[in-house]
């Protein structure tokens, strides 16, 4: 913490500008009144202030408002965001996608991707939903950020929206995330054609349900390995070969190259051996021949 | 074949909460999506929100502070729970399967268990 | 939300003869829509969705058309079996809503 002292006369600060970069960091603290501060947080940015008096200027602020930062303050910080920790971007209120912007700006080739998932989560919080308008920001300005959002959030987003999300933003979602996507993406696209709705829904498949992918196999689509590798194991376990086949069309032969991998790998466990060798991939690990398969997930047979 | 069957108590008091558990039996929990609706005496049918077997949830916005829909995979049942209940929210509860195909990609239903009536009154 | 409604409340009519029921649509559905039919004491079946297409196992008699916000559940050639309650649902949108329902009974 910054010792107290008080402001040598010729110091006393009526401005924030540029002079203030020759301040030791003692007269900073003593000298910058933190309303004079936060009502000219515009001019900040423009100053080169070392990192050491942006931590002054920082605590100036945090004093003045331990609540949380109005967003007429946040939407100046500039780099002074880069001090800030998801601890205090929580206590914010945002609600203008042009406060986003210019703090994701700021944040590019920073290593803060846990603030700028709070910073989202709290834009999010503010604007009530995930409107278009922010999907659309998040897109053009922090590709894959979508995915930083809890699945609660997403949950906030409405189908209407699904279709302004590129391939490229879901990359990094996780199956919860896909899980709330999914359906609102599947709800979006079904008035499409079938070929125009694989092209849309692909990228949201791994959120799919066994009976949606069973579907799709009657399609046509040839799904290519990425996006089958993507699906949930729980989704794949249960289709045939012959669903499997019909699924990926031409790219089937890539299953040997993906054996050892999850969810083939699981895949192919469930499978009777010569159903596999149907393939001619010499996939291993079937079933054997003349072995029962009894299906514990049908529980009604054992209550 | 694949049936659900919902259970739970009659009657709730009003403000408390009421609680139902759909049974699904001949298939997994896992390849769909599950949904409640309600139906007050003489009246047409209400949506009140779905599942999927991963615990991804949504509901109707007039409900949703007050719904809570839970899955357990393991006994292969999904829950719900509608707090603060008024007379208002007697009704048969269904519990229903939404068809969950993308080649007719809809959100309707074509399994539902045979529902339970649940009264509010003190 | 969308709202569905449905009309008429009540249709009077003799076996053997053709009964129309209508639905509309606040807002374009599109063709996202299903007809179920309840009988009393029983749970909803699911008769017809996109519109037009019959679920497994629906006889013939029973056809649906429609697009956007109007839509037709035909039943040509009444039975004693069909006298129930009628009701449409669009999957257009959450929250997915039905209509109030329209009651069919024997004149």
């Known amino acids: 913490d910054v010792e107290r002292t008080t402001c040598p006369p010729e110091k006393e600060v009526h401005e924030i500008d540029e002079s203030l970069i020759f301040y030791k960091k003692r007269e900073l603290e003593a000298c910058v009144d933190a309303a004079l501060l936060a009502a000219q947080m515009d001019r900040v940015d423009a100053i080169p202030f070392t990192y050491e008096q942006l931590d002054v200027l920082k605590h100036k602020l945090d004093e003045l408002y331990p609540q949380g930062y109005p967003e007429s303050v946040i939407r100046h910080l500039g780099h002074l965001f880069l001090k800030m920790s998801p601890e205090d971007i929580r206590k914010w209120n945002v609600t203008s996608l042009e406060t986003l912007k210019a703090l994701l700006k700021v944040s590019k080739g920073h290593e803060m991707s846990a603030q700028v998932a709070t910073l989202i989560d709290r834009v999010v919080v503010g604007r009530g939903q995930l409107d278009k308008d922010t999907v659309d920001t998040l897109t053009a300005f922090c590709p894959g950020c979508l995915c930083s959002l809890s699945p609660e959030r997403l949950s906030s987003v409405p189908p209407s929206v699904i279709g302004a999300v590129r391939p490229q933003d879901l990359d990094t979602c996780g199956p919860r995330q896909l899980d709330v996507l999914y359906p609102k993406a599947r709800l979006a696209f079904q008035n499409m054609s079938g070929s125009e709705y694989f092209v849309k829904i692909r990228p949201f498949l791994g959120g799919a349900p066994t009976e949606d992918v069973k579907a799709l196999s009657q399609q046509n689509v040839s799904m290519d390995l990425a996006t089958f590798m993507k699906l949930r194991r729980e989704a794949v376990l249960p289709l045939t070969v012959a669903e499997v086949q019909k699924l990926l069309g031409p790219h089937v032969e890539g299953l040997k190259v993906e054996e050892q991998h999850s969810p083939v790998r699981d895949w192919i466990l469930k499978q009777r051996q010569d159903d596999l060798d149907t393939l001619g991939l010499g996939l291993q690990g079937g079933i054997p021949n003349g072995y029962l398969i009894l299906d514990l997930s049908v529980r009604e047979a054992l209550s | 074949q694949v049936q659900l069957q919902e259970s739970g108590p009659g009657l709730v008091k009003p403000s408390e909460t009421l609680s139902l558990t759909c049974t699904v039996s001949?298939?997994?929990?896992?390849?769909?999506?599950w949904s409640w609706v309600r139906q007050p005496p003489g009246k047409g049918l209400e949506w009140i929100g779905y599942i999927f077997y991963s615990g991804s949830t949504n509901s109707n916005p007039s409900l949703k502070s007050r719904v809570i829909i839970s899955v357990d995979t393991s006994k292969n049942q999904f829950s719900l729970k509608l707090s603060s209940v008024t007379a208002a929210d007697t009704a048969v509860y269904y519990c229903a399967r939404e068809v969950g195909r993308i080649a007719v990609a809809g959100w309707f239903f074509d399994l539902w268990g045979r529902g339970t009536l649940v009264t509010v009154s003190s | 939300e969308i709202v569905m409604t449905q009309s008429p409340a009540t249709l009077s009519v003799s076996p053997g003869e053709r009964a129309t029921l209508s639905c509309r649509a606040s807002?374009?559905?599109?063709?996202?829509l299903a007809w179920y039919q309840q009988k009393p004491g029983q749970a909803p079946r699911l008769l017809i969705y996109g519109a037009s297409t019959r679920a497994t196992g629906i006889p013939a008699r029973f056809s649906g058309s429609g697009s956007g916000t109007e839509f037709t559940l035909t039943i040509s050639s009444l039975q004693s079996e069909d006298f129930a309650v009628y009701y449409c649902q669009q999957y257009n949108n959450w929250p997915l809503t039905f209509g109030q329902g329209t009651r069919l009974e024997i004149k």
């Open positions: 001949g298939g997994s929990i896992n390849n769909y999506y």
């Open positions: 807002q374009s559905v599109n063709a996202n």
